[in-house]
Interface confidence: low
C-alpha cells in the first residue's frame, strides 16, 4: 500500500459498499499522486479502534462516547477532523448537554434530589450519561445497578428505554417507557415536552432543543438552565451554563505515525469534491444504502482538528468526568480533608525544585506538577493533572479562552490591606542605554530586541501589540534585526540574540537565560538594543540588588525608557513614559477548583508570604533571587479579586481586544484549540 | 425543600461554652451536607464548621480547631456546634445551612464556599463579652 494511502475502517456491509465508492470516486478526481482511499472492514467501532492502534488501519468516525475508548491506553488515538453541521459561516462542531428548567421553579443543581426528571432516552449522551455521570457521587449507593440508584435519586422519571418492569419509577412519567416517537416522551423534543407539560422539573437534553421547539422568544424566557455553580442562566447563555460541551463526530488516528494530515488532505478534496451539494453521483454526507455511513448524514463538512488539542483537551473536562464516573464508577469513601491538595503547575527544573521545597514546607496541603511551556501548564490544569499556576496577563488570556478562571492577584505595593485590594496594574516599558542616544520608539526597525516571552504582556503583547498598528503585519522577526524572545520558532532571527544552550536555546522557561524579566534586561546589557520589561525590573536589577556577576555593578542612571510620542525619560519617570499599563499577574484554577485554590493560597501567603523576615533561613513563597520563579519576586500578597472573577473582568476591556488584535499573529497552538472548542 | 431552623445562641463571657443546635425538616437528603456559617455585619459571611451527615465526617475552619465541635444527631436530623473557650471575636451571626453540594462537603467550609449552600436558616446571634 503506498504511504499516501488512507485505510479507513467500515464497520457494516452497507459501509464497506460506500468505502469503496468513496475510493473509486476519490481516484477520479484525485492526481496519482495525491491521497487515496483503501477499505478495511471489521466487526465493531471498537475493532477498528483496535485496528487504528495496530496500524492495520488509519482513520474511522466515531461519537464522543468512543472517541473517549480511543483515547484510553492501549489505544491512544487522538481526534484529528470534526464534522461540522449549520453553515460554512457559523460551523458547529460541538453541541452543549444542557439541564432546562421552568423559571419559576426555585432549585438548583445541588438541589435535584427529589425531583421529576425527563431524559431523551437511557444511555444516551445528553440525555442520561452526561447528567447521571456528574451526578454520580451523588447518587444513593449501592450506585449498582445505576438504575436503580437513579430510580432512588428522583422522585420520578422518563427515560426511554429503561426496564420499566424492574424499575417502574423511572418510567413513571411516560408509561411503558417506549424507545421510539410512538413514546411522546422520546427524545430530545420528547423530554422538553416532558418538561413543558409539566410532567417533570428538568429536562436533560441539548442547548439547540429548546430553539428547536419554542420559536418565539416570549416563549423561552419561561425557561432557565442550571449551571455546574448552582446558579441559573437564560437558555441562549448555553456556553457559559452547560453539564457539557460535546463532540457531535469525530475521525480519529494514532497519537503517533496517525497520518493526521494525510487525512486531512485526503477529506478536504474529498469534501470539494463530493460534499453537499456537489456532486450527484457521489456524496459524501448521504447513506443511499442506510443512515450515517462512514459519516453522518446531517454532516455538511469537515473541520480539521489542531494539532495541539488531544482527545481529553478535545472531549473536555466535564465530559471526560461524566464518563470516567460512569465507567469506573469509583467516588471518594470520604473527602480527605477540606481541600485536596493543590497541584501546582511549576515551569521546568528552577521552578520545580522551588516548588517542591513549599510542597514539603506546606505539609501535603501543595503537590507539584512539572511542564515545559506555559501553555503547557495551562493544557495540565485544563484537564485535572494539575490545579493551579501564577501566570502573566498573556497567559491569563489564553487560560481564559481555555476555560480557566482567575482567582487571585499578585499585589506588588505595600498597604494596609493589601488583601482586599487589587491592585490597577504594573507599567510595560521599553528600556534602552543611555548610551544608544539617537534611538527612540519612532526608529526601532532593524534594532536587537529583548522580549520576556512571546505571549507575554510586558514583553510582547503590548509591544508588538502597539508595532502591529503601525506596521499592519506579523513578521516582527523582519522587523527587528535580530533578537531573544522566548518561544519563538527556533529558526526566527527572534531566537538568534538568545544564550540558552542546545535544546534549550530560545525555550519559554528558565533553561533560557535571557528568559522572563531579568532575562530580557541581561539580553539588553549584554547584547540587544532594547528591552520590553516591567518598570520595576531596572531597579530591581542595578544598584547592587541583583548579585549576579552581569548584573552587580550596574547603574540604574545607565538606562532610559522610550516614550511613545518618541522622547527618553529617565527610568523612575516611567508613569509618564511608559508603553502601556498592564494587568497585574494572577493565580488560574478551573471552576470548581476555586474555592479550594482561594482558601489554601491564603493560608500559604499566610505562613510564608512577605510576613516572613528571614528567607535564608525559611521558606519564601515569593523570593527567588530574581527568578520569578513560581510567582514575581516583587509580590507583596495575592489579592482577592471580589467582581472581577472572569478573565475578560480581570484582564479589561482595552488589554482583551488589544490581545484579541494580535490573535492574528498567534502562534499559539493552545489558543487555536481552545477557540476551536469555543470560536 | 429543607427547612433549617436554628436555636441556642445567646450572651456569654469570654472563656464560656454554648451549644448551638439546627434542626432540619423536609427533604434530609438534601442536607446530607450541613454546615455553621458565621457573618459579622459589614464582612462575608465565613464557614466555621461542616459535618457530611451521610459519613459522619467533620470538618473545622482553623480559627476554631480545639475549641469547636460539629455533631450530629440522626435520629432527630439535628446538628449541632458545641463551641467552648468562646473569644470575643467569636460574636457573630451564626447560620445553618444545608447542601448535598455538587462538589465536596468540605468546600461549604470555605468562607466563599457560601456558594454551594443550598438552604439557610434564619440566624441566631452570638455574644462574646471579655
Known amino acids: 500500500v503506498p504511504d499516501k494511502t488512507v485505510r479507513w475502517c467500515a464497520v457494516s456491509e452497507h459501509e464497506a459498499t460506500k468505502c469503496q465508492s468513496f475510493r473509486d470516486h476519490m481516484k477520479s478526481v484525485i492526481p496519482s499522486d495525491g491521497p487515496s482511499v483503501a477499505c478495511v472492514k471489521k466487526a465493531s467501532y471498537l475493532d477498528c479502534i483496535r485496528a487504528i492502534a495496530a496500524n492495520e488501519a488509519d482513520a474511522v468516525t466515531l461519537d464522543a462516547g468512543l472517541v473517549y475508548d480511543a483515547y484510553l491506553a492501549p489505544n491512544n488515538l487522538k481526534p484529528v477532523v470534526a464534522e461540522f453541521y449549520g453553515s460554512k459561516e457559523d460551523p458547529q462542531t460541538f453541541y452543549y448537554a444542557v439541564a432546562v428548567v421552568k423559571k419559576d421553579s426555585g432549585f438548583q443543581m445541588n438541589q435535584l434530589r427529589g425531583k421529576k426528571s425527563c431524559h431523551t432516552g437511557l444511555g444516551r449522551s445528553a440525555g442520561w450519561n452526561i447528567p447521571i455521570g456528574l451526578l454520580y457521587c451523588d447518587l444513593p449507593e449501592p450506585r449498582k445497578p445505576l438504575e436503580k440508584a437513579v430510580a432512588n435519586f428522583f422522585s420520578g422519571s422518563c427515560a426511554p428505554c429503561a426496564d420499566g418492569t424492574d424499575f417502574p419509577q423511572l418510567c413513571q412519567l411516560c408509561p411503558g417507557c417506549g424507545c421510539s416517537t410512538l413514546n411522546q416522551y422520546f427524545g430530545y423534543s420528547g423530554a422538553f415536552k416532558c418538561l413543558k407539560d409539566g410532567a417533570g422539573d428538568v429536562a436533560f437534553v441539548k442547548h439547540s432543543t429548546i430553539f428547536e421547539n419554542l420559536a418565539n422568544k416570549a416563549d423561552r424566557d419561561q425557561y432557565e438552565l442550571l449551571c455546574l455553580d448552582n446558579t441559573r442562566k437564560p437558555v441562549d447563555e448555553y456556553k457559559d451554563c452547560h453539564l457539557a460541551q460535546v463532540p457531535s463526530h469525530t475521525v480519529v488516528a494514532r497519537s503517533m505515525g496517525g497520518k493526521e494530515d494525510l487525512i486531512w488532505e485526503l477529506l478536504n478534496q474529498a469534501q470539494e469534491h463530493f460534499g453537499k451539494d456537489k456532486s450527484k453521483e457521489f456524496q459524501l454526507f448521504s447513506s443511499p444504502h442506510g443512515k450515517d455511513l462512514l459519516f453522518k448524514d446531517s454532516a455538511h463538512g469537515f473541520l480539521k482538528v489542531p494539532p495541539r488539542m488531544d482527545a481529553k483537551m478535545y472531549l473536555g473536562y466535564e465530559y471526560v468526568t461524566a464518563i470516567r464516573n460512569l465507567r469506573e464508577g469509583t467516588c471518594p469513601e470520604a473527602p480527605t480533608d477540606e481541600c485536596k491538595p493543590v497541584k501546582w503547575c511549576a515551569l521546568s527544573h528552577h521552578e520545580r525544585l522551588k516548588c517542591d521545597e513549599w510542597s514539603v514546607n506546606s505539609v501535603g496541603k501543595i503537590e507539584c506538577v512539572s511542564a515545559e511551556t506555559t501553555e503547557d501548564c495551562i493544557a495540565k490544569i485544563m484537564n485535572g493533572e494539575a490545579d493551579a499556576m501564577s501566570l502573566d496577563g498573556g497567559f491569563v488570556y489564553i487560560a481564559g479562552k481555555c476555560g480557566l478562571v482567575p482567582v487571585l492577584a499578585e499585589n506588588y505595593n505595600k498597604s494596609d490591606n493589601c488583601e482586599d485590594t487589587p491592585e490597577a496594574g504594573y507599567f510595560a516599558i521599553a528600556v534602552v542605554k543611555k548610551s544608544a542616544s539617537d534611538l527612540t520608539w519612532d526608529n526601532l526597525k532593524g534594532k536587537k530586541s529583548c522580549h520576556t516571552a512571546v505571549g507575554r504582556t510586558a514583553g510582547w503583547n503590548i509591544p508588538m501589540g502597539l508595532l502591529y498598528n503601525k506596521i499592519n503585519h506579523c513578521r516582527f522577526d523582519e522587523f527587528f534585526s535580530e533578537g531573544c524572545a522566548p518561544g519563538s520558532k527556533k529558526d526566527s532571527s527572534l531566537c538568534k540574540l538568545c544564550m540558552g544552550s542546545g535544546l534549550n536555546l530560545c525555550e519559554p522557561n528558565n533553561k533560557e537565560g535571557y528568559y522572563g524579566y531579568t532575562g530580557a534586561f541581561r539580553c539588553l546589557v549584554e547584547k540587544g538594543d532594547v528591552a520590553f520589561v516591567k518598570h520595576q525590573t531596572v531597579p530591581q536589577n542595578t544598584g547592587g540588588k541583583n548579585p549576579d556577576p552581569w548584573a552587580k555593578n550596574l547603574n540604574e542612571k545607565d538606562y532610559e525608557l522610550l516614550c511613545l510620542d518618541g522622547t527618553r525619560k529617565p527610568v523612575e519617570e516611567y508613569a509618564n513614559c511608559h508603553l502601556a499599563r498592564a494587568p497585574n499577574h494572577a493565580v488560574v484554577t478551573r471552576k470548581d477548583k476555586e474555592a479550594c485554590v482561594h482558601k489554601i493560597l491564603r493560608q500559604q501567603q499566610h505562613l510564608f508570604g512577605s510576613n516572613v523576615t528571614d528567607c535564608s533561613g525559611n521558606f519564601c513563597l515569593f523570593r527567588s533571587e530574581t527568578k520569578d520563579l513560581l510567582f514575581r519576586d516583587d509580590t507583596v500578597c495575592l489579592a482577592k479579586l471580589h467582581d472581577r472573577n472572569t478573565y475578560e473582568k480581570y484582564l479589561g476591556e482595552e488589554y482583551v481586544k488589544a490581545v484579541g488584535n494580535l490573535r492574528k499573529c498567534s502562534t499559539s497552538s493552545l489558543l487555536e484549540a481552545c477557540t476551536f472548542r469555543r470560536p | 425543600h429543607v427547612q433549617l431552623v436554628e436555636s441556642g445562641g445567646g450572651s456569654v463571657q469570654a472563656g464560656g461554652s454554648l451549644r448551638l443546635s439546627c434542626a432540619a425538616s423536609?427533604?434530609?437528603?438534601?442536607?446530607?451536607?450541613m454546615a455553621w456559617f458565621r457573618q459579622v455585619p459589614g464582612k462575608e459571611r465565613e464557614g466555621v464548621a461542616a459535618?457530611?451527615?451521610?459519613?459522619?465526617?467533620?470538618y473545622l475552619t482553623d480559627s476554631v480547631k480545639g475549641r469547636f465541635t460539629i455533631s450530629q444527631d440522626n435520629a432527630k436530623n439535628t446538628v449541632y456546634l458545641q463551641m467552648n473557650s468562646l473569644k470575643p471575636e467569636d460574636t457573630a451571626m451564626y447560620y445553618c445551612?444545608?447542601?448535598?453540594?455538587?462538589?465536596?462537603?468540605?468546600?461549604?467550609?470555605?468562607?466563599?464556599?457560601?456558594?454551594?449552600?443550598?438552604?439557610w436558616g434564619q440566624g441566631t446571634q452570638v455574644t462574646v463579652s471579655s
Open positions: 445551612a444545608a447542601s448535598n453540594t455538587f462538589y465536596n462537603c468540605g468546600a461549604l467550609n470555605l468562607g466563599i464556599g457560601a456558594g454551594l449552600v443550598a438552604y
Open positions: 459535618i457530611d451527615t451521610s459519613r459522619g465526617r467533620a
Open positions: 423536609g427533604d434530609t437528603y438534601s442536607s446530607k451536607c
